[in-house]
């Protein structure tokens, strides 16, 4: 899978869409996970409704939401109040049994907001020690919807 880059802006919302073949993935739940390291596991952030027919309902985990258009074949992830630690590699997955197919690999980049000065007139510049690896998967990622889906193995 090629990696699709999505640039989000700090403090704003980001939407990531993952397109997929609706027939091939019929009846499958989807998930959004964060890749831990280059060859590490993909830690699930959020998955669609336990009942596939209700996949259109938006589910939240912290500031990350997921919704699935199962007819149109588009999985949408919303990352709210994007922060520098949200930057990193993610996957949209399609779940079947204990397996997960990757629908799209997504690299989220978090950019400075040139216009949001928080009324202070100065941008906040994170320290060098605040690396992306320190981020918690639960943290929100905000941004416009992108086309893509995230299949993750169902939660036990």
């Amino acid at each position: 899978h090629n990696t699709t880059v999505f640039q989000g802006v700090a403090g704003q919302s980001l939407q990531v869409s993952c397109p997929y073949d609706s027939m091939k993935h019929w009846g499958r739940r989807k998930a959004w996970c964060r890749q831990l390291g280059e060859k590490g596991p993909c830690q699930r952030v959020v998955s669609t409704h336990n009942l596939w027919l209700l996949s259109f309902l938006r589910r939240w985990n912290g500031s990350t939401a997921i919704t699935d258009d199962t007819l149109g074949g588009t999985l949408t992830i919303t990352l709210r109040n994007l922060q520098p630690h949200d930057a990193g590699l993610y996957q949209c997955q399609s779940l079947h049994g204990s397996e997960a197919d990757t629908l799209r690999k997504v690299l989220v980049e978090v950019l400075a907001d040139p216009l949001d000065h928080r009324d202070a007139g100065d941008l906040w510049f994170p320290g060098e020690s605040e690396s992306f690896e320190d981020a918690h998967v639960e943290h929100s990622i905000s941004r416009s919807l992108l086309e893509g889906e995230i299949p993750f193995p169902p939660t036990s």
């Epitope: 704003q12 939407q15 919303t78 950019l111 400075a112 040139p114 216009l115 000065h117 994170p126």
Partner: antibody
């Protein structure tokens, strides 16, 4: 192909009002942050205003020089953005370009309209 | 606001020459969080709107000839045009988008 088409420019007297419009095509307009940038021989290129997308609450931002006088708005159903300019001053004269800082995926002024000329003069 | 100073203000060149345009920022436009320089270069031909050439100081836009190269970091940036062509005669602007949105005054590239 991404396109921006501006309209509404012309001649107006100081203190007067004018409304510029821009229609966009070739991309998902509702995802984009829409901007107006103006250009004059005196001030060069100058960012004027921005309106963000729905997911970011259609937040608006303005350059200090136009704050309180200009209002940016958008209609996603028509893929259009407008700039209402009130209390116009001679220094507001210039070519006004419609552009987009962020298209929902990338941050940069990648595409610009051809511009519409606004002349504020007695 | 961050101010951008471009030099020279104008430059007369011959076809085939290598040209170097400078842009200096009053503050760093490097954002340590994502290791990017928030600086872009635009080309504007007479009667036309600006065209994006380079973003993130060195990323060439799709369709831009590889004779255009952006470099630099922090406060000092350069746009290099290797072997200038007649169609490159234009005004070149740098633009920062880290803190507010500001543009340089431009460098006019003319034929010698």
């Amino acid at each position: 192909e991404v396109k921006f088409e501006e309209s509404g420019g012309g001649l107006v007297q100081p203190g007067g009002s004018m409304k510029l419009s821009c229609t966009a095509s070739g991309f998902t307009f509702s995802d984009a942050w829409m901007d107006w940038v103006r250009q004059s021989p005196e001030k060069g290129l100058e960012w004027v205003a921005e309106i963000r997308n729905k997911i970011n609450n259609h937040a608006t931002y303005y350059a200090e020089s136009v704050k309180g006088r200009f209002t940016i708005s958008r209609d996603d159903s028509k893929s259009s953005v407008s700039l209402q300019m009130n209390s116009l001053r001679t220094e507001d004269t210039g070519i006004y370009y419609c552009t987009s800082l962020y298209d929902g995926s990338y941050l940069r002024f990648a595409y610009w309209g051809q511009g519409t000329l606004v002349t504020v003069s007695a | 606001n961050i101010m951008l100073t471009q030099s020279p203000s104008s430059l007369a060149v011959s076809a085939g020459e290598k040209v170097t345009l400078s842009c200096k920022s009053s503050q760093s436009v490097f954002y340590s969080s994502n290791q990017k320089n928030y600086l872009a270069w635009y080309q504007q031909k007479p009667g036309q709107s600006p065209k994006l050439l380079i973003s993130w100081a060195s990323t060439r836009e799709s369709g831009v000839p590889d004779r255009f190269t952006g470099s630099g970091s922090g406060t000092d940036f350069t746009l290099t045009i290797n072997s200038v062509q007649a169609e490159d005669l234009a005004v070149y602007y740098c633009h920062q988008y880290l803190s507010s949105l500001t543009f340089g005054a431009g460098t006019k590239l003319e034929l010698k």
